[in-house]
């Protein structure tokens, strides 16, 4: 969802060695070692060449800001912080570039970013301010309006001791900074659950994207506030079932769509409500694709096609009838 | 307690050279950008030059980079300035400041007290 | 380079009242977010001390009665109520390019 530039004349930039001793900020069109930059496009892309550091000498017109496939591992408070600021500077795509942590005000004077995208990089440690920059109660509001963070879960091995969805959900909230934010990605985090606050404290969002995580359950998730909500994608998670209480509210937003393959349903005598749900409501996308995984004798069975007398539950025994 | 200690100043010639020095404590030294700044008696503030953690980036004001050189030493916690062919009017304060954020400098929490620079015959 | 244009030159307050003390960039200093112009306190054979950054952030363990505002070109530093405390020179500082540059300051007198 990152922009890429039109076909337009890129130059580069042979790579120096000398350090950058100056009077004077870079040249408006000068390009970064072991980067290409178009000033016609606003783009500058300094892709898969194992990078260590954000350039310094980044040129003032750039707009679309290209760092993927390199080896960053830090990204520091300010690390785009420049004299003159970077103030055009747009879309930033940081993906797959090894970062593993993101400090407090990473992306600080930066005040027209509006996406960014942190995605396939294995984020053990991201500040809880690093989108806010600031650890005061309300920061001024940042200008992004959608965050990419797609596969950022580091191997289990790398992980800190606090739980990976309260990392990424306190660098969302901190500061209520990002109440502009319009599209969300949190897909491919291993996420088991989701914190209650989260979406209560993202009133803008149109898009939020929960696909391919683990999550269970959404009982303790509320969408009431969401009603700007347009898609809501929970493919390939572990949900199986949804009550009463998500289906009222995810009926009552005006504009959303939701998607809700590949989850394991299980269509048992609790599934009642939703199939009943499914057959009336307009908002799941793809609907007649949903099946039944548990019990065993239900599994491929179409929700759709389900009647109440196919969802039973077996009765609990009294504990003196039941076996070992 | 960030503490920032110039020496290195005197009396000098016209022509002559001065090596100042700014000893910081309190603070990891190798995180910061350090920076000159000088004062004319009863003249405005004027920068000097800055300096990244690395040593990479180094900036001067146009005026000055011919004859000052900063540099510095993570290890010694030291920051420097070599000044070269120095005239009547580089007599000054000279300050080294240090801002609070670790990255290049906007504005400056921490300042030393300064050393005097006299150039005269 | 950018010059900072500061005005008065001097300026001479009673006790308790308010002394507004202007700072005019050569060019602006501002994006949507940030004003890159910064206010400092320097009193005689003392460095400078920072008082406000971005044109309007108080430092911490500044006193309240120091405030900024401005954009663009035109920044303003308020001390309202002078103290006997506040005799000083004061300065505006930009960051928006290299040179940093500072205004030649105004020295504040309390009457």
């Known amino acids: 969802s990152s922009p890429t530039s039109s076909a337009s004349s890129f130059s580069s930039s042979a790579p120096f060695l000398a350090s950058a001793v100056s009077a004077q900020p870079p040249l408006p069109d000068q390009c970064p070692a072991l980067c290409e930059c178009s000033e016609a496009a606003r783009t500058v892309k300094c892709v898969n060449r194992n990078l260590t550091e954000v350039p310094t000498d980044l040129p003032a017109y750039v707009r679309n800001l290209f760092l993927t496939g390199n080896q960053l591992a830090v990204l520091p408070a300010g690390a785009f912080a420049r004299r003159p600021p970077l103030a055009e500077l747009a879309a930033l795509n940081l993906s797959g570039s090894r970062l593993d942590e993101v400090r407090a005000g990473a992306f600080e004077h930066l005040p027209s970013l509006r996406q960014l995208d942190l995605s396939h990089n294995p984020l053990a440690d991201l500040s809880p301010f690093a989108f806010s920059g600031s650890n005061a109660s309300v920061s001024a509001p940042s200008p992004l309006v959608e965050l990419i963070l797609n596969h950022i879960v580091p191997p289990e091995d790398e992980r800190q001791n606090r739980s990976f969805e309260g990392m990424v959900v306190a660098a969302l909230l901190a500061g209520r900074a990002l109440q502009g934010l319009r599209r969300l990605e949190l897909a491919s985090n291993h996420f088991l659950y989701l914190p209650r606050d989260v979406l209560a404290q993202l009133p803008s969002l149109r898009h939020l994207d929960l696909s391919n995580n683990s999550l269970v359950s959404l009982t303790y998730v509320s969408f009431r506030n969401l009603t700007h909500l347009e898609s809501l994608h929970l493919e390939d998670n572990a949900l199986k079932v949804l009550h009463n209480g998500t289906l009222a509210e995810l009926q009552g937003l005006p504009h959303i769509r939701v998607f809700l393959d590949n989850n394991p349903w299980v269509c048992d005598c609790h599934m009642a409500d939703m199939v009943t749900w499914l057959k009336e409501t307009e908002v799941v996308q793809g609907k007649d694709r949903l099946t039944c995984a548990y019990p065993e004798k239900m599994r491929n069975r179409v929700l759709l096609e389900l009647n109440s007398a196919d969802l039973d539950c077996d009765p609990i025994l009294p504990p003196s009838l039941q076996t070992s | 307690e960030v503490q920032l200690l110039e020496s290195g100043g005197g009396l000098v010639q016209p022509g002559g050279s001065l090596r100042l020095s700014c000893a910081a404590s309190?603070?990891?030294?190798?995180?910061?950008?350090m920076t000159w700044v000088r004062q004319a008696p009863g003249k405005c503030l004027e920068w000097v030059s800055e300096?990244?953690?690395?040593?990479?980036?180094?900036n001067y004001t146009p005026s000055l980079k011919d004859r000052f050189t900063i540099s510095r030493d993570n290890a010694k916690n030291t920051l420097y300035l070599q000044m070269n062919s120095l005239r009547a009017e580089d007599t000054a304060v000279y300050y080294c400041?240090?801002?609070?954020?670790?990255?290049?400098?906007?504005?400056?929490?921490?300042w030393g007290q300064g050393t005097t620079v006299t150039v005269s015959s | 380079d950018i010059v900072l244009t500061q005005s008065p030159a001097s300026l001479a307050v009673s006790l308790g009242q308010r002394a507004t003390i202007s700072c005019r960039p050569s060019?602006?200093?501002?994006?949507?977010?940030?004003?890159?112009i910064h206010w400092y306190q320097q009193k005689p054979g003392q460095p400078p001390k920072l008082l406000i950054k971005?044109?309007?952030n108080l430092e911490s363990g500044v006193p309240a009665r120091f405030s900024g505002s401005g954009s663009g070109t035109d920044f303003t530093l308020t001390i309202s109520p002078v103290e006997a405390e506040d005799t000083a020179t004061y300065y505006c500082?930009?960051?928006?390019?290299?040179?940093?540059?500072f205004g030649c300051g105004t020295k504040l007198e309390i009457k």
């Open positions: 400041a240090r801002p609070d954020h670790d990255y290049n400098p906007y504005y400056f929490n921490y």
């Open positions: 309190g603070f990891d030294f190798s995180r910061y950008w």
């Open positions: 300096i990244n953690p690395d040593s990479r980036t180094i």
């Open positions: 060019q602006s200093v501002s994006t949507s977010s940030n004003s890159y």
């Open positions: 971005y044109a309007s």
């Open positions: 500082q930009q960051s928006w390019e290299i040179p940093l540059t």
